[in-house]
């Protein structure tokens, strides 16, 4: 499965939109910084097969979409930017779903895929827990926005490596 060039553009657009969504200066939230322990090894496209990489990308975008589709998220961000951001993510999910079916097949996800997917889920669970603990404060959301920009950058790099493999 060849991810269309539009997929990569969509990822870049999503990153730009997420950058524009910032409402407060990150410097005013330095005390709220948190290490969410991004599973960097899951974004190393050299260490696993294409099917596994696509599964990781899909889970990453799905969890990002879920995170920004909550009521708490709606209250935190400017509505039109949030809608555009969600639309970009939704389009990427559609692109990736076609690839997941083609690459991984409709059979049960292999063990390695499962392990990578669970690493991504645990990462997002930590982000969600952090927001709950900080009562969805503006600074908590700002820290999370910066973290998701970082994880989307990892996703973009993984996509680039996938295309080079093709």
């Amino acid at each position: 499965c060849d991810l269309p060039q539009t997929h990569s553009l969509g990822n870049r657009r999503a990153l730009i939109l997420l950058g524009q969504m910032g409402r407060i200066s990150p410097f005013s939230c330095l005390k709220d910084r948190h290490d969410f322990r991004i599973p960097q090894e899951e974004f190393d496209g050299n260490q696993f097969q294409k099917a596994q990489a696509i599964s990781v990308l899909h889970e990453m975008i799905q969890q990002t979409f879920n995170l920004f589709s909550t009521e708490d998220s709606s209250a935190a961000w400017e509505q039109s930017l949030l809608e555009k951001f969600s639309t970009e993510l939704y389009q990427q999910l559609n692109d990736l779903e076609a690839c997941v079916i083609q690459e991984v097949g409709v059979e049960e996800t292999p063990l390695m895929n499962e392990d990578s997917i669970l690493a991504v889920r645990k990462y997002f669970q930590r982000i969600t827990l952090y927001l709950i603990e900080r009562k969805y404060s503006p600074c908590a959301w700002e820290v999370v926005r910066a973290e998701i920009m970082r994880s989307l950058s990892f996703s973009t790099n993984l996509q680039k490596r996938l295309r080079r493999k093709d």
Epitope: R37, L111, L118, K122
Partner: antibody, heavy 122, light 107 residues
């Protein structure tokens, strides 16, 4: 086959220290949270603490924080629960459990160890 | 903490009967409700997760429903193996909490 095999029963005196173990096999150890659950004989279940074996990130039930500690040894795929000073009220069966995490980030306990009975008595 | 209250605390039934156990949470837990069965002298085992999903290998006579603050476990056509204690659990908020248990015994 997923297995969580716990150490045998322990009889201890108040004030003693203790570490009980849970050896897991049949899956990738670092992929799933592991929790400990307490059951006082004839009573209900209480969740104590969970750990991510990947990096030892832990979340405690405040009721148990400071009294017990959880740790892992990745090299032998084993999770531990430790007390530095046991009390009579720690007498219970302790279960280690594996969490599954769904796409909507719902945790549930899909595999349980057989339990370790800890009896604390003078 | 989120309190989980099961009702009834105990009930008697016969093989072949149907029974329903209810669990109420002190605040909404969405669908983060799970049900476990514990046979005497054994570890608990998962029956239902996320309120209504049957765990692999669990017979279809077990069904779960509900969300928010209330969920139910229904067992149809009771088998001898089903006489045990049943626990509900929430994993929506920390600390995770269980109901006090419902003991199902033979009438």
């Amino acid at each position: 086959e997923v297995q969580l095999v716990q150490a045998g029963a322990e009889v201890k005196a108040p004030g003693e220290s203790l570490r009980i173990s849970c050896k897991v096999s049949g899956y990738t150890f670092t992929s799933y949270w592991i929790s400990w659950v307490r059951q006082i004989p004839g009573k209900g279940l209480e969740w104590m603490v969970k750990i991510d074996p990947r990096d030892s990130y832990t979340i405690y039930n405040p009721s148990f924080q400071g009294h017990v500690s959880i740790s892992v040894d990745k090299s032998i795929t084993t999770v531990y629960l430790q007390w530095s000073s046991l009390q009579a009220s720690d007498t219970a069966i302790y279960y280690c459990v594996r969490h599954y995490l769904t796409q909507s980030l719902v945790d549930y306990f899909d595999h349980w160890g057989q339990g370790t009975l800890v009896a604390v008595s003078s | 903490d989120i309190q989980m209250t099961q009702s009834p605390s105990s009930l008697s039934a016969s093989v072949g009967d149907s029974v329903t156990i209810t669990c109420r949470a002190s605040q909404s837990v969405s669908n983060y409700f799970h049900w476990y069965r514990q046979k005497p002298g054994k570890a608990p085992e998962l029956l239902i997760y996320s309120a209504s999903n049957l765990q692999t290998g669990v017979p279809s006579r077990f069904t779960g429903s509900g969300s928010g603050t209330e969920c139910t476990l229904t067992i149809t056509s009771l088998q001898p193996d089903d006489f045990a204690t049943y626990y509900c659990q929430q994993t929506h908020g920390y600390p995770f909490t269980f109901g006090q248990g419902t003991k199902l015994d033979v009438r």
